[in-house]
């Protein structure tokens, strides 16, 4: 991704900028943005970034708040790149089954599953 | 989802069935299926289930292997339901920022980020 800093550092910096600019960002009291009901965040990246787009269009730009939205757009680029890597490599059934087993195992242990 | 057992139990059972039917599933030696390169599984659910569809269409059905694919289709239904919940609720900016902060926090600590 076109950034001098690694993605992990970019995420950390973005979290800090989010705290700094919170007051400015919540200034629009009538704005409503879709918020996922669950915490399986990776399933909702598209909606989260649509929400960020809505917020950006309603926020007075200038100073480091621009840096915040620039960072968020770089994070989106990174995630889009990861999504591309979901289907780039065509492998044999054996490898697919190993990955499927891993996926189900992760669902089993790490996903937030409602009964 | 239309199943008598909770999703968590469904996932466990599916993992067991996957082990049981491995030999049958890998019978097709020429079949190639996209396998994600990374371990951010939730980003790749669409591709994973497309792969499952490809595998199902190439597998001789009958007995408990049908149960395996039935379970996988119920898991897909559950995930599709979760994806619907990404944009069902329109909330104030404050709530959206809380969720965004949580999302970035999870990226920071739990995602598999390449440098």
């Amino acid at each position: 991704i076109p950034t001098e800093i690694p993605t992990s550092a970019l995420v950390k910096e973005t979290l800090a900028l989010l705290s700094t600019h919170r007051t400015l960002l919540i200034a629009n009291e009538t704005l409503r943005i879709p918020v996922p009901v669950h915490k399986n965040h990776q399933l909702c990246t598209e909606e989260i970034f649509q929400g960020i787009g809505t917020l950006e269009s309603q926020t007075v730009q200038g100073g480091t708040v621009e840096r915040l939205f620039k960072n968020l757009s770089l994070i989106k680029k990174y995630i889009d790149g990861q999504k591309k890597k979901c289907a780039e490599e065509r492998r044999r059934v054996n490898q697919f089954l190993d990955y499927l087993q891993e996926f189900l195992g992760v669902m089993n242990t790490e996903w937030i599953i409602e009964s | 989802i239309p199943t008598e057992i909770p999703t968590s139990a469904l996932v466990k059972e599916t993992l067991a069935l996957l082990s049981t039917h491995r030999t049958l599933l890998i019978a097709n030696e020429t079949l190639r299926i996209p396998v994600p390169v990374h371990k951010n599984h939730q980003l790749c659910t669409e591709e994973i289930f497309q792969g499952i569809g490809t595998l199902e269409s190439q597998t001789v059905q009958g007995g408990t292997v049908e149960r395996l694919f039935k379970n996988l289709s119920l898991i897909k239904k559950y995930i599709d339901g979760q994806k619907k919940k990404c944009a069902e609720e329109r909330r104030r900016v404050n709530q959206f920022l809380d969720y965004l902060q949580e999302f970035l926090g999870v990226m920071n600590t739990e995602w598999i980020i390449e440098s």
């Epitope: 492998r91 044999r92 190993d98 990955y99 891993e102 | 396998v35 994600p36 390169v37 371990k39």
Partner: antibody, heavy 119, light 107 residues
């Protein structure tokens, strides 16, 4: 930087077992599979199997199934390869190697551990 | 198991020579092949993956080509540090298998 550091040389008697360690550093241990490869003196390379530290799942070359056991200790970012019922033909240098991605090429190799089986 | 047949098993060449090593798979392995260099007493080092992708830090005189069953490693201008044994590895299917190696010696 990314490194795999293996345990020192071992001398074992036929019928015994050996456990070789491979300590990972410089990256998140659970993100990459660890493969094990061996090389008998003056011979080529042979794949033993891989372990996925993310879920402890391992897969073996049929030739070693039942004799090789791959494990990990996530708390110390260490992978282990145990080989039992040793025979003289198991004398070899054993390497651990990291998968770049899921079932990809080996991007980082350990320095190797010589295991000598001799009565 | 997929058999990997490498040729030649050894070759003598001079500094500056162009060297070609081939590897043939017993079945289609797509492009899931890497080339590995090993110097005496040292750990192996991967040079090329996915048949033709050079790994970061590997000199550009190394190149790979091929797909399906036939693959080639080329060293465009042999350097003193390139004298070593080269192996191909298929990581298309389990068990992963290596070629028997090609020893590149000084003429």
């Amino acid at each position: 930087q990314v490194q795999l550091v293996q345990s020192g040389a071992e001398v074992k008697k036929p019928g015994a077992s050996v456990k070789v360690s491979c300590k990972a550093s410089g990256y998140t241990f659970t993100n990459h599979h660890i493969n094990w490869v061996r090389q008998a003196p003056g011979q080529g390379l042979e794949w033993i199997g891989y372990i996925n530290p993310y879920n402890d799942y391992s897969r073996y070359n049929q030739k070693f199934k039942g004799r090789a056991t791959l494990t990990v200790d996530k708390s110390t970012s260490t992978a282990y390869m145990e080989l039992s019922s040793l025979r003289s033909e198991d004398t070899a240098v054993y390497y651990c190697a990291r998968d770049y991605g899921n079932f990809w090429y080996f991007d980082v190799w350990g320095q190797g551990t010589l295991v000598t089986v001799s009565s | 198991d997929i058999q990997m047949t490498q040729s030649p098993s050894s070759l003598s060449a001079s500094v500056g020579d162009r060297v070609t090593i081939t590897c043939k798979a017993s079945q289609d392995i797509n492009s899931y092949l890497s080339w590995i260099q090993q110097k005496p007493g040292k750990a192996p080092k991967t040079l090329i993956h996915r048949a033709d992708r050079l790994i970061d830090g590997v000199p550009s005189r190394f190149s790979g080509s091929g797909s399906g069953q036939d693959f080639t490693l080329t060293i465009s201008s042999l350097q003193p540090e390139d004298f070593a044994t080269y192996y191909c590895l298929q990581y298309d299917d389990f068990p992963y298998t290596f070629g028997q190696g090609t020893k590149v010696e000084i003429k």
